[in-house]
């Protein structure tokens, strides 16, 4: 069966919206009107991964674009980066763990945890117009909430 | 009043390894972003590294990535630059900056020299 | 890598002149441009950030403007103290990039 998807963006709990900054990389950062339309659509895609009534396994697509958020160790560190696929092969149900993020809802308020380096969370910084980040903390300076708002296809 | 003080440059061969440090004072060191950035003698300016508030991101130029290794201390309010496997063409003024709004430099330190010769 | 050029490089004035230098960068980068100032033996002075605000404490004989790529700080009426070399920065992705500088010398 085809993997079910649906197109949203994600603004952190400061309503910083996320944009593209050069080919490879998001940053955060507050718009409003017309520039609403630089903010990045992603295709959310459900995945196998582990599941639970508040916890799951999604892969984070660009929409239209063969780019996913992916997670990787750089320099012995866990660092999110934005990753080329063969779009004829993605996405997929059974998507490597590095695209994988568990996605866990807390009052009403969305976190993205890597699968693959549990404990590290997709961040946005307090400042503005800086990096989307793998961060491997919570509750302190970086912002690991996000809401989702729905895309029409 | 916001102050950023770089020490640790000098004389280094190449091949060499130099730990460069900015104290910063007159502001909450741990809520801001910082850079390093240089300056070759007689040049212009290079961005070098940046560093988020908690030290969870950080990001180099081509130039110096995989020899230079940015880092700080929130408790002793200080950044670091450790620099290793250094080259003639780092020679430069090093110069610590606190990221203002939107990614620009507010405030910079005097600058610390780097010579790299034999 | 987004590439930002300054002109011109260099530009003799007078006191009292009005001046404007240039920066193009290769890409669009909306709003995301700073200008510096630096004096020699000096660490350089933020003047303008996101393109036309004016840095607090710099005189308002200072401005900037443009957006996308093209973008221009003009100063009104040079004064003694404002012979100096000026860079402008994108911030718009990293790495961040500089023009290689407009020195501005005395007439």
């Known amino acids: 069966a085809p993997v079910r998807s649906l197109n949203c963006t994600l603004r952190d709990s400061q309503q910083k919206s996320l944009v593209m900054s050069g080919p490879y990389e998001l940053k955060a950062l507050h718009l409003q009107g017309q520039d609403m339309e630089q903010q990045v659509v992603f295709s959310m895609s459900f995945v196998q991964g582990e599941e639970s009534n508040d916890k799951i396994p999604v892969a984070l697509g660009l929409k239209e674009k063969n780019l996913y958020l992916s997670c990787v160790l750089k320099d012995d560190k866990p660092t999110l980066q934005l990753e080329s696929v063969d779009p004829k092969n993605y996405p997929k149900k059974k998507m490597e763990k590095r695209f994988v993020f568990n996605k866990i809802e807390i009052n009403n308020k969305l976190e993205f945890e890597s699968a693959q380096f549990p404990n590290w969370y997709i961040s946005t910084s307090q400042a503005e117009n800086m990096p989307v980040f793998l961060g491997g903390t919570k509750g302190g300076q970086d912002i690991t909430d996000f809401t989702m708002q729905f895309v029409s296809s | 009043e916001v102050q950023l003080l770089e020490s640790g440059g000098g004389l280094v061969q190449p091949g060499g390894s130099l730990r460069l440090s900015c104290a910063a004072s007159?502001?909450?060191?741990?809520?801001?972003?910082m850079f390093w950035v240089r300056q070759a003698p007689g040049k212009g300016l290079e961005w070098v590294s940046v560093?988020?508030?908690?030290?969870?991101?950080?990001r180099y130029a081509d130039s110096v990535k995989g020899r230079f290794t940015i880092s700080r201390d929130n408790s002793k309010n200080t950044l670091y630059l450790q620099m290793n496997s250094l080259r003639a063409e780092d020679t430069a003024v090093y110069y610590c900056a606190r990221v203002g709004y939107g990614g620009n430099s507010d405030y910079w330190g005097q600058g610390t020299l780097v010579t790299v010769s034999s | 890598d987004i590439q930002m050029t300054q002109s011109p490089s260099s530009v003799s004035a007078s006191v009292g002149d009005r001046l404007t230098i240039i920066c193009r960068a290769s890409?669009?980068?909306?709003?995301?441009l700073a200008w510096y100032q630096q004096t020699p033996g000096n660490a350089p002075k933020l003047l303008i950030h996101s393109a036309t605000s004016l840095q607090s404490g710099v005189p308002s004989r200072f401005s900037g403007s443009g957006s996308g790529t093209d973008f221009t700080l003009t100063i009104n009426s040079l004064q003694p103290e404002d012979f100096a070399t000026y860079y402008c920065q994108q911030a718009d992705s990293f790495p961040l990039t500089f023009g290689g500088g407009t020195k501005v010398e005395i007439k």
């Open positions: 890409q669009d980068i909306n709003r995301w």
């Open positions: 007159g502001f909450t060191f741990s809520k801001y972003w």
């Open positions: 560093i988020s508030p908690s030290g969870g991101m950080t």
